[in-house]
């Protein structure tokens, strides 16, 4: 990673997953080791992300396992890059009226999307559901990330940064739990009744404010429109 990276030394240590959610399914944005970006129906080690806020609503998104920044080319294709280019790897974050988040390139104006079509963001537009995201805390045990949590006094600082360049696995104070309004009791994923609000189990876990260290009421996200 270049020294100029805005991610190195970040004090925000929470891993989150960005996912799209329609009435019946959800896909988690994942950045693979080869830089390919796609969606998975469940949390994976490649969908564990770190999101860092910058000024004026800009964010930088990084795949923890791939150690790649989420970037966009001039055609609107998203990809993961080891190199941080401020023009291609920063996104404008906006929360829509429905509470879902959209991310678009200030350089090329295209939306970050798990759909294959490339669409420019226009104020007031209603993007397709695969361009609207919710966030969710990481539920994958850190051991699955295959990156040892550095043990104190046993490795040099250089070793630590090499094994954990994004500083996401070092022990930190736990994030504040989501407020009660964000973490209601949900029905079983196998509940097929028409009133089951989360039949695919995709909204388990409290919503998080993905761009700050803790969650307050402003960190709540709507529950997806599940039957």
């Amino acid at each position: 990673y270049p020294n100029a990276s805005p991610l190195l030394g970040s004090s925000w240590g929470g891993l989150i997953h960005l996912y799209t959610a329609t009435a019946r399914n959800s896909y988690h944005l994942q950045i693979h080791k080869n830089g390919h970006v796609d969606g998975a129906p469940h949390q994976t080690i490649y969908s564990a992300l770190m999101i860092r806020s910058e000024d004026a609503g800009f964010v930088v998104i990084t795949g923890v396992m791939s150690r790649r920044y989420l970037c966009m080319d001039f055609r609107g294709n998203i990809f993961g890059s080891h190199y941080f280019d401020p023009e291609n790897c920063r996104f404008q974050h906006q929360t829509l009226e429905n509470g879902y988040d959209v991310y678009h390139s200030p350089q090329y104006h295209f939306l970050v999307s798990l759909g294959r079509a490339k669409r420019a963001f226009l104020p007031g537009m209603n993007p397709p559901p695969y361009s609207q995201f919710l966030s969710r805390r990481n539920e994958i045990p850190l051991i699955h990330f295959n990156t040892p949590i550095p043990r104190r006094h046993t490795q040099s600082a250089e070793d630590d940064s090499e094994r954990d360049p994004l500083n996401v696995l070092k022990p930190r104070a736990r994030m504040t739990p989501a407020p009660a309004s964000c973490s209601q009791e949900l029905p079983s994923a196998e509940d097929n009744s028409p009133m089951a609000s989360d039949p695919l189990g995709v909204v388990r876990g409290g919503r998080v404010n993905t761009h700050a260290g803790g969650t307050g009421p402003e960190g709540c996200r709507p529950f997806a429109k599940f039957i």
């Epitope: 799209t20 329609t22 009435a23 019946r24 399914n25 896909y27 796609d38 969606g39 998975a40 129906p41 469940h42 798990l114 759909g115 294959r116 079509a117 669409r119 537009m125 209603n126 993007p127 397709p128 559901p129 695969y130 994923a189 196998e190 097929n192 039949p199 695919l200 189990g201 429109k225």
Partner: antibody, heavy 117, light 106 residues
Amino acid sequence: QVQLVQSGAEVKKPGASVKVSCKASGYTFTNHYMHWVRQAPGQGLEWMGIINPISGSTSNAQKFQGRVTMTRDTSTSTVYMELSSLRSEDTAVYYCARDIVDAFDFWGQGTMVTVSS
Amino acid sequence: AIQLTQSPSSLSASVGDRVTITCRASQGISSALVWYQQKPGKAPKLLIYDADSLESGVPSRFSGSGSGTDFTLTISSLQPEDFATYYCQQFNDYFTFGPGTKVDIK
């Protein structure tokens, strides 16, 4: 190449159950939701339900609540759809289809289920 | 749930004709609309996704347009292999299909 291969045609009596299988190959099975869609003779397409391949969680169209059960076997990359309490109006071709976020890109060849006394 | 209506329900056309099929959603669905072609005894085939994006391998005579509630599938010059039934499907909320439009030979 991606392939979805379904089980063969079935003839069932009213009140019985039928279980249709769909074996996936050519891609990572757990990376895509699978849907079931049916088509009665001379009629349109009707979405029945969806299954999450990794968790096995399912969600069905309200019309089929309580009658349809979708399961999967990750070891064989196969999804199953069981429809119970069959009636004559369940006579249809049943399709499995792979979800790729913005469309169903691959479909099985279809399984004809005939319900007749 | 969002309902889709297609018009016409059937049409007769000749090879070389320009054919237009419309799909209307009961509420706005952004661009989350797909078009499929189905021939007798066969599974549906994906033609258009995200309202106006052509699926790989589909001839360029097929095109889609629209956003919100009104969508159109156009075949610029009908070919013999295009006689089939066409379905729209929305991806905004559930996965509802339209009732279909049958295109047959005049």
